[in-house]
Structures are given as C-alpha cells and as structure tokens.
C-alpha cells in the first residue's frame, strides 16, 4: 500500500480468482483513543472499533472511503483504490490501446518544433468518475524539470456502438535548448483513476522522435505563361523552430485528381517553391518534414488547381 | 585544450555536400545494423545513449546559431560564447567562432573514425561474420575531414590484446551509430546554416 495523495492510498493486488488479497491497517488521524468506530462509503454499518482497523482487501467491494467517527463526528477519511496486477502485468483497463506505432501504445505525444513543448493525448471509452494527473521529467534517475498542465477532454468521437473520449495535456521542458542533442529521454507519467480503480501509464521519448511540423503556410499558385504548369510556393509554418537555415525542412508536393484512384504526382524539394502541372479539378498539396531527422510528416496544406 | 585554428574553405561549402553524404551514409548503416542485429538491443529505446565526444569537443555549443545565443538554456554549458560587449559581433570574432566550430566538427569526426576502425577490426574477427562497417561511411568521414582541411595530431588506432566479446562489440556498434547519427544531424544543420550565412 502506498499514498497517492493526502488520505488517498493505492493497494496493489495480485489479481486472480480466490486470491488472498492484502491485509491493510488503517489508522484514524486523531488524538482520540476511545469510542472510535469505522464505516465504509455511505453505509452506516460499523466495520470495527478502535483507533486502527485491519481489513483484508481482495476485491473492489473492499475498496472505497473508510471513515472513522466518534459520537457522530467525522474524525478522518482514508480512500482506498485498487491497482490490479494480472499475472505480473499491471492492468490497463482505463485507456484504449491506440496500437500506433506499436501494440501497447496508450499515450501518444507530438511536438511542433524543438522548443521543448509537446502535447500528449490518450483515449478512453469511460465518460464518468474519471480523473487524470500528469507528471513529466527529462530522465528518471536524476530528473530535470518538465511542467505539464491539467489534462482536459479534447475530443469526443463515435466509434461503432461506443463513444470514445480523447484527453490531452500540454507540457513544456523548463530549460530547453532547441539545438541540444538529447541523450536522456522525456518521461511522461499519467495516473488514471476510474471509480476505485487506479492505473498508471508511461511513455518515454526524445523530442526529436515526436516532431511533427505544422503544415506549410501561405500555399499559393502562380500560373506560368503559355503553359499548363504552375509555380507553387509556400512558407515555413510559424510554429517551426528558427533559424530556418539551421532547422531546415524538406517538402513533398502532390498533385491529386478528384478521384482517389487517379495517379498522384509527387515531387520532393528542399526549396519553398516547385513547378508542377495543374490538371483540371485537381488539387495541390504540400507537407513538411525535418530535413535531417526523419520524424513525422506534417498534415497536408492544400489548394485547388482551378 | 587548444583546438587547431581553421582556415575555412572560401568556397563554403563543398562541406555542405559532404555533410549530407555523411548523414545519408550513417543513417543507412544504422538501418542495416538494426535489421542485421534484430536480436540485439539496437533500437533507440533499448540502447544507452552515450556520447564519446562528451567533455572532449563542444560542437553543439561552438556551432550554436547566433539567433540561439539569446537562449539561456543553450548557453548553460558553454565555455565559449558568441556574446560580446556590443550588440553586434565583430567579423573577426565571427570567423574565429566559425573556426572553433569547424575544428570541433573535425575532432568529432576524427574520434568517431578511430572508434569505427577499431570496432571494424574486431568485427572482422567474428566467426559469425554478421556485420561490418560500411566502407562508404568510413570514406565519407574521411572526405569531410579533408574538406574541413585541418591539421591535427593523428590519433593512433586502439589495439586490444584480449579476445573481443563480439556481443558487447555489436551493442557498442549500435550505441556508436545512434550517437554518430545525432551528431551527423547537428553537423548537417551547422553546414546548412553556415552556407546560408
């Protein structure tokens, strides 16, 4: 058993049918010695008396808010949460496995640049009685500071019969140098509590590996005289690290017909312009990627050919 | 420690071309190592990230773009700083800093070259003959060093008398390649920046 926060305790249980559970001793936070009784949650049934209460915690029915009283007055509370260990593996019931980029990916994180700011998000089908708390650091043995905000509900989606809820959090490394070569990964730890179930999820990454630039901005077309060709031009996104000659991007320009089946023409360039043939009803899209370290491509920025 | 003073090549930047080749070569070699050594801990998540140039060179600091010298976090570990008393940088100071930057890159390349050659000698003794260093990568390191045009003492290739532990050697190869790829990215950024300046 360990303390999650004041008066909230997590009991770790080896979770299998007929498991003996864990013996827990609760102590009433009071100078009083006599006439103390204990109850669980809203029930008025007296579970025991005395300054301490010994309980065998086996299932969720044994968890909850234990209260000690004296003469009708509440003295203190202890909330017990359960953390299930199933055959050596901590349970992951609360969050959905996003399966990208690999199985057992519960937290996904992205950064728009090298400033040390990043966003993480996760999915759940649970809509109520749910709280999250996020901590982060650079490295784990001698951790350096990363400050995270509060997790907020950022999207709701309907997936078949189920509703899916997306939560996200923004974090910022306290003293980040965009040019630094990372040798210690960022660690992100999310505590999740659903009703009386506690779970924790972690992710470890280098900022360089989670970079996903914003799409190029000011995408424009300039027709070339007496030709079906157009000059496409664009600019680096505002959110990208500067100077751009040091933090350079590379670009992919795509000409896509109205039908998804039509052949796509693609050009790769390090410049911020390209000459392409504009077909009728087609659209031109451009996306960006770090020129030197191949992390994710940005989303496409698009303009119609007409 | 005195870094050799550079005479930066006036036509800046055959170096840019060579640094791009270097990044391509080390990335290919790392990919090959990850595939060949699939049963070894060779991914970024599995290895310890070590920098053999730590405390010996200061490439990131010496080659920091002017625009980032205002960022306190980038100056924390700097022995040399771009910042001068005035609001502008004297051109003499700039060329000195550039020389310091390029000589630091040269020292990095020299250190990695020695490590890779020593390692290759060990890998050639492996009866499994599982993986060797790409000669193209070693050649590209050499070409960039020549383009940087520095003279410094040659570092003798390390020779070891004891029987090599091939498992450890292969894990060390992964660690070296990951670190060298990160340094190659920095070198490429620096060359691109200097080329634009």
């Amino acid at each position: 058993i360990w303390e999650l926060k004041k008066d909230v305790y997590v009991v770790e249980l080896d979770w299998y049918p007929d498991a003996p559970g864990e013996m827990v001793v609760l102590t009433c936070d009071t100078p009083e010695e006599d006439g103390i009784t204990w109850t669980l949650d809203q029930s008025s049934e007296v579970l025991g008396s005395g300054k301490t209460l010994t309980i065998q915690v086996k299932e969720f029915g044994d968890a909850g808010q234990y209260t000690c009283h004296k003469g009708g007055e509440v003295l203190s509370h202890s909330l017990l949460l359960l953390h299930k260990k199933e055959d050596g593996i901590w349970s992951t019931d609360i969050l959905k496995d996003q399966k990208e980029p690999k199985n057992k990916t519960f937290l996904r994180c992205e950064a728009k640049n090298y400033s040390g700011r990043f966003t993480c998000w996760w999915l759940t089908t649970i809509s109520t009685d749910l709280t999250f708390s996020v901590k982060s650091s650079r490295g784990s043995s001698d951790p350096q500071g990363v400050t995270c905000g509060a997790a907020t509900l950022s999207a709701e989606r309907v997936r078949g019969d189920n509703k899916e809820y997306e939560y996200s959090v923004e974090c910022q490394e306290d003293s980040a140098c965009p040019a630094a070569e990372e040798s210690l990964p960022i660690e992100v730890m999310v505590d999740a509590v659903h009703k009386l179930k506690y779970e924790n999820y972690t992710s470890s990454f280098f900022i360089r590996d989670i970079i996903k630039p914003d799409p190029p901005k000011n995408l424009q077309l300039k027709p070339l005289k007496n030709s079906r060709q157009v000059e496409v031009s664009w600019e680096y996104p505002d959110t990208w690290s500067t100077p751009h000659s040091y933090f350079s991007l590379t670009f992919c320009v795509q000409v896509q017909g109205k039908s998804k089946r039509e052949k796509k023409d693609r050009v790769f360039t390090d410049k911020t312009s390209a000459t392409v043939i504009c077909r009728k009803n087609a659209s031109i899209s451009v996306r960006a990627q770090d020129r030197y370290y191949s992390s994710s491509w940005s989303e496409w920025a698009s303009v119609p050919c007409s | 420690r005195n870094l050799p003073v550079a005479t930066p090549d006036p036509g800046m930047f055959p170096c840019l071309h060579h640094s791009q080749n270097l990044l391509r070569a080390v990335s290919n070699m790392l990919q090959k190592a990850r595939q060949t050594l699939e049963f070894y801990p060779c991914t970024s998540e599995e290895i310890d990230h070590e920098d053999i140039t730590k405390d010996k060179t200061s490439t990131v600091e010496a080659c920091l773009p002017l625009e980032l010298t205002k960022n306190e976090s980038c100056l924390n570990s700097r022995e040399t700083s771009f910042i001068t008393n005035g609001s502008c940088l004297a051109s003499r100071k700039t060329s000195f800093m550039m020389a310091l930057c390029l000589s630091s890159i040269y020292e990095d390349l020299k250190m990695y070259q020695v490590e890779f050659k020593t390692m290759n000698a060990k890998l050639l003794m492996d009866p499994k003959r599982q993986i060797f260093l790409d000669q193209n990568m070693l050649a590209v390191i050499d070409e960039l060093m020549q383009a940087l045009n520095f003279n410094s003492e040659t570092v003798p290739q390390k020779s070891s008398l004891e029987e090599p532990d091939f498992y450890k050697t292969k894990i060390k190869l992964c660690i070296l390649l990951h670190a060298f790829r990160i340094r190659a990215v920095t070198i490429d950024r620096v060359m691109s920046y200097l080329n634009a300046s």
């Epitope: 080896d14 979770w15 299998y16 049918p17 007929d18 498991a19 299932e59 969720f60 260990k85 199933e86 055959d87 050596g88 593996i89 019931d93 496995d97 690999k102 199985n103 057992k104 089908t125 | 049963f39 801990p41 599995e46």
Partner: antibody, heavy 115, light 111 residues
Framework: QVQLVQSGGGVVQPGRSLRLSCAAS????????MHWVRQAPGKGLEWVAF????????YYADSVKGRFTISRDNSKNTLYLQMKSLRAEDTAVYYC????????WGQGTMVTVSS | SYVLTQPPSVSGTPGQRVTISCSGG????????VKWYQQLPGTAPKLLIY???QRPSGVPDRFSGSKSGTSASLAITGVQAEDEADYYC????????????FGTGTKVTVL
C-alpha cells in the same frame, strides 16, 4: 472454490462450426479476464484467445484470427468460443482458463474436425 | 504463434536433480514473467511456478524456477517417480495479456 466446467465439444466436418462453453462458479466471474488454450493430440499447448473481464477487448492467435470468436455473458457466468470454418488442424482438446498469476483450468473438451 | 524453446525430453534417476530450460527472446521472457506447468497424461495442466520463481501453495519445494535474461529454467531437486510428466513454460509477448506464449514442452522420464 473456483470451478470451470466445459461443454460443447464433439466431431464436426471441415468447414462447419461449433460453439464451446465454459461455466464458471466459485468466484466473481465478471472481474477476471479469460483465455482459451488448446492442445492437439500428442502436441504442446497453444494459446487461442483472450477476453477482458468486461468483454471490451479480445485477442486471438494468428492461426484462428477471423474464424474464431471469444465472448462472455457475465450475467450467466459463462465464457464461449464460437469456431467457424473449422479445419483438420483445429482438432484438439480445448481448455478455458482464468487469467492471473494463479490460473484455474477447465477439464478440457475434445474437438475433432474430420470428414 | 510465438514459441518458447524447450528440450523435447530430459531424464534422471530418482533423487537426481533434473533441469529444464526454456529459451525465448527480448519481447517475451526478456520483458515478462515466466510460469511453469506440469501435465500428467489425460489431465489439464497444473501450475507449478508463477512469477519466475514463486511456488503456489501445495507445490512441493523440490520444484524451483529461475529466470535470466531471455531464458528461464525449472529445476526438480530429488526427482521422484510421480514427477514423470510433460512440463511447459509460459510467458507473454511484449507485456501483452492478449498474447500468451507457451514452450514446446519437455517430457521428463524418471528412470
């Protein structure tokens, strides 16, 4: 105490279907994940499928993916394995087991796929 | 399906020490706990060891388990005639409850 009683095995022709059941008692069935494991005659144990305590997630071995469906009815304390497009290589004793460090196994039920 | 490798058979005389190896990889034994089962002919497997080296109550202390890196082993110190059976190791792939992996099985013969 914990008991898992299996039923539904038998002889079936290739391409046909069969549904196995596993009735649980002596524990809170709805709180625990469940597996199906099989053993071909004279061969070793092979994991087949797993279902979470609430039925929200199901996982399958590649050899049965798309043909077998694991399901549960927590109100009836019963685990199921629906087997379709059966093949000769599916011939085995099928066991249901609880998930956890101390697992409990059913008695096994024989499925024979033969023409 | 993923398979953990065990020797097909091992044998020993009563009172001898018998060990069975179970070899896996980084994604299964290397990152998860190991269990061992004993299976007597015509019966369901019985749990002998969980959590690499833990014995459930009722399992004789002559059975012991250990794990090192990507391999595990089961030792029977002072093997007895009633220990003649098939033995299987089991783990999970990539810390994933939905992918239980078993060993190929070892027949223990008491001479």
């Amino acid at each position: 105490q914990v008991q898992l009683v299996q039923s539904g095995g038998g002889v079936v022709q290739p391409g046909r279907s069969l549904r196995l059941s596993c009735a649980a008692s002596g524990f809170t069935f709805s709180s625990y994940g469940m597996h199906w494991v099989r053993q071909a005659p004279g061969k070793g144990l092979e994991w087949v499928a797993f279902i979470r305590y609430d039925g929200s997630n199901k996982y399958y071995a590649d050899s049965v993916k798309g043909r077998f469906t694991i399901s549960r009815d927590n109100s009836k304390n019963t685990l199921y394995l629906q087997m379709k497009s059966l093949r000769a290589e599916d011939t085995a004793v099928y066991y249901c087991t609880t998930h956890g460090s101390h697992d409990n196994w059913g008695q096994g039920t024989m499925v024979t796929v033969s023409s | 399906s993923y398979v953990l490798t065990q020797p097909p058979s091992v044998s020993g005389t009563p009172g001898q020490r018998v060990t069975i190896s179970c070899s896996g990889g980084r994604s299964n034994i290397g990152s998860n706990t190991v269990k061992w089962y004993q299976q007597l002919p015509g019966t369901a497997p019985k749990l002998l060891i969980y959590g690499n080296d833990q014995r459930p109550s009722g399992v004789p202390d002559r059975f012991s388990g250990s794990k090192s890196g990507t391999s595990a082993s089961l030792a029977i110190t002072g093997v007895q005639a009633e220990d003649e059976a098939d033995y299987y190791c089991q783990s999970y792939d990539r810390g994933f409850t939905g992918s239980r992996v078993f060993g190929t099985g070892t027949k223990v013969t008491v001479l």
